[in-house]
C-alpha cells in the first residue's frame, strides 16, 4: 500500500488572507491523508507558536472529515476570529498535520488590507483637493509621482517539509 505523509493543500503560498480590522478572519486548513491502518491522523493550528487554547484571542476552530471510497481521508479545520484586530493580523498562523508516516506544517499568508486611500493635494491657490476612495493610486501633479499604498504589513513565514528533509518509510 502506497501510504504517504499528510499533504497540506491549504494554507499555501498562493492564497493570501487579506482583512481589515473588525472583519472576520477565516483560514482553512485542509489536509489529505492516505489510508494507513491504525494511523491516528491529527490536524492542529498554532498561533504564534501556541495552541489556540493557550492564548487569549477569541478564536474558534471547526473540523470536518471526509473519506474517499479507498478510505483516504481529508480533514478540514477552519480557524475563525470573528472580529480580527490589527495585532491579530500580524500573528503567525500555522497549520500542522501528523500521521504515522510523518509530520508537516504550513503557514498561512495573512496581511492587513490597506483601506482605500484618501490623498490631499495642496493646490497652488491654497485649496485642498482630496482623492477619492477607489483604492487606486492617485497621481500627485506636484511631485509627478504615484502615491502608492503601504507595503505589506505582514507576510507569514513559510514552513515546508520537503521529502528530502523528512523521509518516513
Amino acid at each position: 500500500k502506497n501510504a504517504v505523509p499528510p499533504v497540506i493543500h491549504s494554507p499555501n503560498d498562493h492564497v493570501v488572507y487579506e482583512k481589515e480590522p473588525g472583519e472576520e478572519l477565516l483560514i482553512p486548513c485542509t489536509v489529505y491523508f492516505s489510508f494507513l491502518m491504525d494511523s491516528r491522523n491529527e490536524v492542529w493550528w498554532t498561533i504564534d507558536g501556541k495552541k489556540p487554547d493557550d492564548i487569549t484571542i477569541d478564536v474558534t476552530i471547526n473540523e470536518s472529515i471526509s473519506h474517499s471510497r479507498t478510505e483516504d481521508e481529508t480533514r478540514t479545520q477552519i480557524l475563525s476570529i470573528k472580529k480580527v484586530t490589527s495585532e491579530d493580523l500580524k500573528r503567525s498562523y500555522v497549520c500542522h498535520a501528523r500521521s504515522a508516516k510523518g509530520e508537516v506544517a504550513k503557514a498561512a499568508k495573512v496581511k492587513q488590507k490597506v483601506p482605500a486611500p484618501r490623498y490631499t493635494v495642496e493646490l497652488a491657490c491654497g485649496f485642498g483637493a482630496t482623492g477619492g476612495g477607489s483604492g487606486k493610486p492617485i497621481p500627485n501633479p506636484l511631485l509627478g509621482l504615484d502615491s502608492t499604498g503601504l507595503n505589506d504589513i505582514f507576510e507569514a513565514q513559510k514552513i515546508e517539509w520537503h521529502e528530502h528533509h523528512h523521509h518516513h518509510h
Partner: antibody
C-alpha cells in the same frame, strides 16, 4: 526553456497494458513533483497520477488506483506511467506535466494518445 | 470530491470584445483555483493561480476573481490569439479536478 516530450501511446485492447514515457529538459527535474493528466475524447481534463520530487511518494485518484503506476528516473530526467487492466474509458490524450504539488500544473507536454478498443 | 462546473460551455465572440467565463465549485474552495488556456493543437498553459495571480508571461488583459464557490476569468479586449478552450481547476484537496471547459470561438 521547459520542455516535456511524451511517447509510448498507441492502440491497446481492453484488459491490456502499456507504458508511457516523458523526457524532461530545461529545468532541474529532481526539484519538482511530476504528474500525468489526461484529456478524454470529450475534452474533459482528469488528473491521473503524481510522483513526488524525490520519487518516494506517489498519488492517484480512485479510478486508476491499483491499475496505474507512476515512476521516475532522475538520472535520465524521465517520467513513466505503467498502465494495466486498461478500460475503454482510459482512452485519452495523456499529458506529462510539471506539478506544483499539491496545487497546479505549471508546464505541460504536447501529449501522447492512448486508444483502448477491441 | 469537489465538482467544478464551468459556464458557458462555448461562446462565439469577436476580437476586441470582453469575455467572462465562470466556474462554480460544489463546495467552498477558498480561492484554491487555477485557470488554463488550451489553444487548438497545443497543450494547456497555466494562466492564473490562487484565483487572482497571473502566471509568468500572461498578458494583463487576463484577470481572475472570485471567492467561496464562484470564480471567474475575464479577458478584456479579446485578441485573435486568445481563441481556444479555457479550464478551471481546484487545488483545495485531493483529488484535484477540472471544470468541463469553455470553448471560445470566433463569431
Amino acid at each position: 526553456e521547459v520542455q516535456l516530450v511524451e511517447s509510448g501511446g498507441g492502440l491497446v485492447k481492453p484488459g491490456g497494458s502499456l507504458k508511457l514515457s516523458c523526457t524532461a529538459s530545461g529545468f532541474t527535474f529532481s526539484n519538482y513533483a511530476m504528474s500525468w493528466v489526461r484529456q478524454t475524447p470529450e475534452k474533459r481534463l482528469e488528473w491521473v497520477a503524481t510522483i513526488s520530487d524525490g520519487g518516494n511518494y506517489t498519488y492517484y485518484p480512485d479510478n486508476v488506483k491499483g491499475r496505474f503506476t507512476i515512476s521516475r528516473d532522475i538520472a535520465k530526467n524521465n517520467l513513466y506511467l505503467q498502465m494495466s487492466h486498461l478500460k475503454s474509458e482510459d482512452t485519452a490524450m495523456y499529458y506529462c506535466a510539471r506539478d506544483r504539488w499539491p496545487y497546479f500544473f505549471d508546464f505541460w507536454g504536447q501529449g501522447t494518445t492512448l486508444t483502448v478498443s477491441s | 470530491d469537489i465538482q467544478m462546473t464551468q459556464s458557458p460551455a462555448s461562446l462565439s465572440v469577436s476580437v476586441g470584445e470582453t469575455v467572462t467565463i465562470t466556474c462554480r465549485a460544489s463546495d467552498n474552495i477558498y480561492s484554491n483555483l487555477a485557470w488554463y488556456q488550451e489553444k487548438q493543437g497545443k497543450s494547456p498553459q497555466l494562466l492564473v493561480y490562487g484565483a487572482t495571480n497571473l502566471a509568468d508571461g500572461v498578458p494583463s488583459r487576463f484577470s481572475g476573481s472570485g471567492s467561496g464557490t464562484q470564480y471567474s476569468l475575464k479577458i478584456n479586449s479579446l485578441q485573435s490569439e486568445d481563441f481556444g478552450s479555457y479550464y478551471c481547476q481546484h487545488f483545495w484537496t485531493t483529488p484535484r479536478s477540472f471544470g468541463g471547459g469553455t470553448k471560445l470561438e470566433l463569431k
